[in-house]
Interface confidence: medium
């Protein structure tokens, strides 16, 4: 019969012959022959292959270096790589998450619009009129100015984007 020019899914062409690919988690030891099946071996510890393959070497699991602020989000298996994420208070510097940086804090006059996650930084916004933030924080939103009226007081000092209003007693006219 004519030697094949293409092979089925999960097969590969070698020496005019279709051989079975190795399943995920295994590497190729020797190609099939007319008389023998493809020989595969499981990946070793800390190694993986995540596709049907003809690789002769497994890939090393990613190392989530704790000294770069990284930690293991999910341990690798023989079929999957380790997934790294950042420690609390840090976020990844890239999609591959190879290192982490400290979450940005919002300066006084700015509040947190969106709290940082393991993959995104803090998003800050300026405190609008009627709101303030007097701290540098990665968590705190802008706070509304105190309402002096509801406390039966009057504004003695106007608020800013960094300071609350100062309330004081009303000047009562003597009878």
């Amino acid at each position: 019969p004519e030697p094949p020019t293409a092979c089925r899914e999960k097969q590969y062409l070698i020496n005019s012959q279709c051989c079975s690919l190795c399943q995920p988690g295994q590497k190729l030891v020797s190609d099939c022959t007319e008389f023998t099946e493809t020989e595969c071996l499981p990946c070793g510890e800390s190694e993986f292959l995540d596709t049907w393959n003809r690789e002769t070497h497994c890939h090393q699991h990613k190392y989530c270096d704790p000294n770069l602020g990284l930690r293991v989000q999910q341990k690798g298996t023989s079929e999957t790589d380790t997934i790294c994420t950042c420690e609390e208070g840090w976020h990844c510097t890239s999609e591959a998450c190879e290192s982490c940086v400290l979450h940005r804090s919002c300066s006084p006059g700015f509040g947190v619009k969106q709290i940082a996650t393991g993959v995104s930084d803090t998003i800050c916004e300026p405190c609008p009129v009627g709101f303030f933030s007097n701290v540098s924080s990665a968590f705190e939103k802008c706070h509304p100015w105190t309402s002096c009226e509801t406390k039966d007081l009057v504004v003695q000092q106007a608020g800013t984007n960094k300071t609350d209003v100062v309330c004081g007693p009303q000047d009562r006219l003597r009878a």
Partner: antibody
Framework: EVQLVESGGGLVQPGGSLRLSCAAS????????MSWVRQAPGKGLEWVST????????YYADSVKGRFTISRDNSKNTLYLQMNSLRAEDTAVYYC??????????????WGQGTTVTVSS | SYELTQPPSVSVSPGQTASITCSGD??????AAWYQQKPGQSPVLVIY???RRPSGIPERFSGSNSGNTATLTISGTQAMDEADYYC?????????FGGGTKLTVL
């Protein structure tokens, strides 16, 4: 041969200071994070501090934060622990340990012989 | 703060299998290491990355880690294995040790 040798321990009064050193040899010191671990008499191991390979990242146990400072001099293959405001509860054998890095994930594969710190009046 | 809990002591007869446990919240999501410490000596790494043995550590030492528990197993325990054993893991940029387990070979 990979080796870590601590020095600088001794007797100090409460409130006093001490600087421990750890001389490393037999490996590329600048490529590995290093740690200090202590052991009070008759007690278990307690992690004190870790510094990353470049020296930029430092980590401390809550019990020593603000009092102890870890540092390293990669040109001298030496790790340091500056201990200030010492307390009686800091009395322990202090070990210097090498982080395993990519070879011994999340573990300390080489330890020094330890240096004894006694805080007493 | 993160805590690792070990039994204070474990006893085993020579030739038998000793198991020392270490428990912590979702410990299986972290990598556990184990150290052996004999009286007057520095700790020695016996298991890292849950189940791997450094070169020079006998095959009778093995480890596993899943769920909330890591386990150090010593099969065919010998008198020379009598020591304190400590588990260790990284958690939130800190290194955490278990309280230690004294292994007695009867």
């Amino acid at each position: 041969e990979v080796q870590l040798v601590e020095s600088g321990g001794g007797l100090v009064q409460p409130g006093g200071s001490l600087r421990l050193s750890c001389a490393a040899s037999g490996f590329t010191f600048s490529s590995y994070a290093m740690s200090w671990v202590r052991q009070a008499p008759g007690k278990g191991l307690e992690w004190v501090s870790t510094i990353n390979a470049a020296g930029g990242g430092t980590y401390y146990a809550d019990s020593v934060k603000g009092r102890f400072t870890i540092s390293r001099d990669n040109s001298k293959n030496t790790l340091y622990l500056q201990m200030n405001s010492l307390r009686a509860e800091d009395t322990a054998v202090y070990y210097c340990a090498k982080e395993g890095g990519k070879y011994y994930y999340y573990a300390m594969d080489v330890w020094g012989q330890g240096t004894t710190v006694t805080v007493s009046s | 703060s993160y805590e690792l809990t070990q039994p204070p002591s474990v006893s085993v007869s020579p030739g038998q299998t000793a198991s020392i446990t270490c428990s912590g919240d979702k410990l299986g999501d972290k990598y556990a290491a184990w150290y052996q410490q004999k009286p007057g000596q520095s700790p020695v790494l016996v298991i890292y990355q849950d189940s791997r043995r450094p070169s020079g550590i006998p095959e009778r030492f093995s480890g596993s880690n899943s769920g909330n528990t890591a386990t150090l197993t010593i099969s065919g325990t010998q008198a020379m294995d009598e020591a304190d054993y400590y588990c260790q893991a990284w958690a939130s940029s800190t290194v955490v040790f278990g309280g230690g387990t004294k292994l007695t070979v009867l």
